[in-house]
């Protein structure tokens, strides 16, 4: 069996986790991708997923999770903004490839979020303010994209998550430290 490896990220509350999961371009560019949390003794739980087929560089936001799939680079960018201590845990990017098992993109991410100074605006005169502007989307994110006769022939489809945003943009004002994972070494 393949030894599952983990990459550890230690961040403060309010910061942003910014992970890039790379994949084989030709094989998986338009496949649906998901961000999952894995807890001890439990099956992976899907927290957010891209559309089907996955659209190029089209951000999908579910709560504080933002997914962007860059087909031209073969990478899925996952951001978890305004981190909370309870976000600590083990995460993974996966690609849905029914009828086969979801394909896991190495490595798993061990996120440790601690309380303390996070460099939020106003807490330090040198701190900067990042504002993410994400265009609204009214698309429905379907996870998983395992199609069954019912999901193909009936509308609305099963298990849909409305990922539309209430305003024309999302302002994330207390994000300062963006942690980036190098993908192209």
């Amino acid at each position: 069996a393949t030894k599952l490896t983990e990459e550890k990220y230690e961040l403060k509350e309010g910061q942003t986790l910014d992970v890039k999961c790379d994949y084989t371009l030709e094989k998986f560019a338009s496949s649906q991708k998901a961000w999952q949390i894995i807890r001890d003794g439990e099956m992976p739980k899907t927290l957010a997923c891209t559309e089907r087929p996955s659209k190029n560089s089209h951000p999908v936001q579910v709560g504080r999770i933002i997914l962007e799939d860059y087909h031209d680079h073969g990478l899925l960018r996952v951001r978890m903004v305004n981190l909370q201590v309870e976000d600590s845990g083990l995460y993974q990017c996966v690609i849905y490839q029914p009828p086969k098992e979801p394909h896991m993109l190495f490595d798993r991410i061990r996120l440790v979020v601690t309380k303390g100074f996070s460099g939020t605006p106003g807490s330090n005169e040198n701190s900067t303010q990042n504002v993410y502007k994400i265009p609204p989307t009214t698309t429905k994110a379907l996870c998983p994209l395992y199609t069954s006769p019912r999901t193909v022939t009936q509308a609305p489809p099963k298990s849909t998550a409305d990922v539309s945003t209430p305003d024309s943009e999302i302002n994330l004002t207390n994000v300062t430290d963006i942690i980036r994972v190098p993908v192209f070494n």
Epitope: G63, P99, S148
Partner: antibody, heavy 119, light 113 residues
């Protein structure tokens, strides 16, 4: 359409084991988790555990740990739940239920299998 | 384990009237990262398996009449039947799907007054 068809009713003696089957059809079997839930006569619902038909991995409720075994046969799209060391309190209707992977709720259920444990 | 407490145990409502069932969890079932409450509601009629009505606390399952609605967040949830129909007579269960073991409320029996 999606269907989960379970095996027939069983009568067992205390201390024996029972194996209930659940045959899935109408969807890609390996793409959804399967759960087992039981319901004693006139009582509520109790979650027993989960199996991932794709890899076969399982997780059981602590209460049933050591007594329950969930397996699957991908060639027949069937999951099995075996409960050993039966006692009278295990008399119940046992259901298999398909779990949504995004949302996790149980969207399709088998018709149920009544297991009666009596001496 | 997360304990789910439903109230009332039973409820008698006139046809066309509103029925409200409450469910309280001993711990929050909200995942703040994706802002989803891992709470589902099921309907069970005698001799039948449960039927999924609502998941994520407020997302109606396809094919479920819109008189059924779910609300709430964190630890307190409500299932509302806006205008009770004869076919709604059943036992209703809430279930948390936030962590194993997935647990159900004790059920609420809805009858016609």
């Amino acid at each position: 359409q999606v269907q989960l068809v379970q095996s027939g009713a069983e009568v067992k003696k205390p201390g024996a084991s029972v194996k209930v089957s659940c045959k899935a059809s109408g969807y890609t079997f390996t793409s959804y988790y399967m759960h087992w839930v039981r319901q004693a006569p006139g009582q509520g619902l109790e979650w027993m555990g989960i199996i991932n038909p794709s890899g076969g991995s399982t997780s059981y409720a602590q209460k049933f740990q050591g007594r329950v075994t969930m397996t699957r046969d991908t060639s027949t799209s069937t999951v099995y739940m075996e409960l050993s060391s039966l006692r009278s309190e295990d008399t119940a209707v046992y259901y298999c239920a398909r779990g949504l992977i995004y949302g996790d709720a149980f969207d399709y259920w088998g018709q149920g299998t009544l297991v009666t444990v009596s001496s | 384990d997360i304990v789910m407490t439903q109230s009332p145990d039973s409820l008698a409502v006139s046809l066309g009237e509103r029925a409200t069932i409450n469910c309280k969890s001993s711990q929050s079932v909200l995942f703040s990262s994706n802002n989803k409450n891992y709470l589902a509601w099921y309907q069970q009629k005698p001799g039948q398996p449960p039927k999924l009505l609502i998941y994520w606390a407020s997302t109606r399952e396809s094919g479920v009449p819109d008189r059924f609605s779910g609300s709430g967040s964190g630890t307190d949830f409500t299932l509302t039947i806006s205008s009770l129909q004869a076919e709604d007579v059943a036992v209703y269960y809430c279930q948390q799907l936030a962590s194993y073991p997935y647990t159900f409320g004790g059920g609420t029996k809805v009858e016609i007054k």
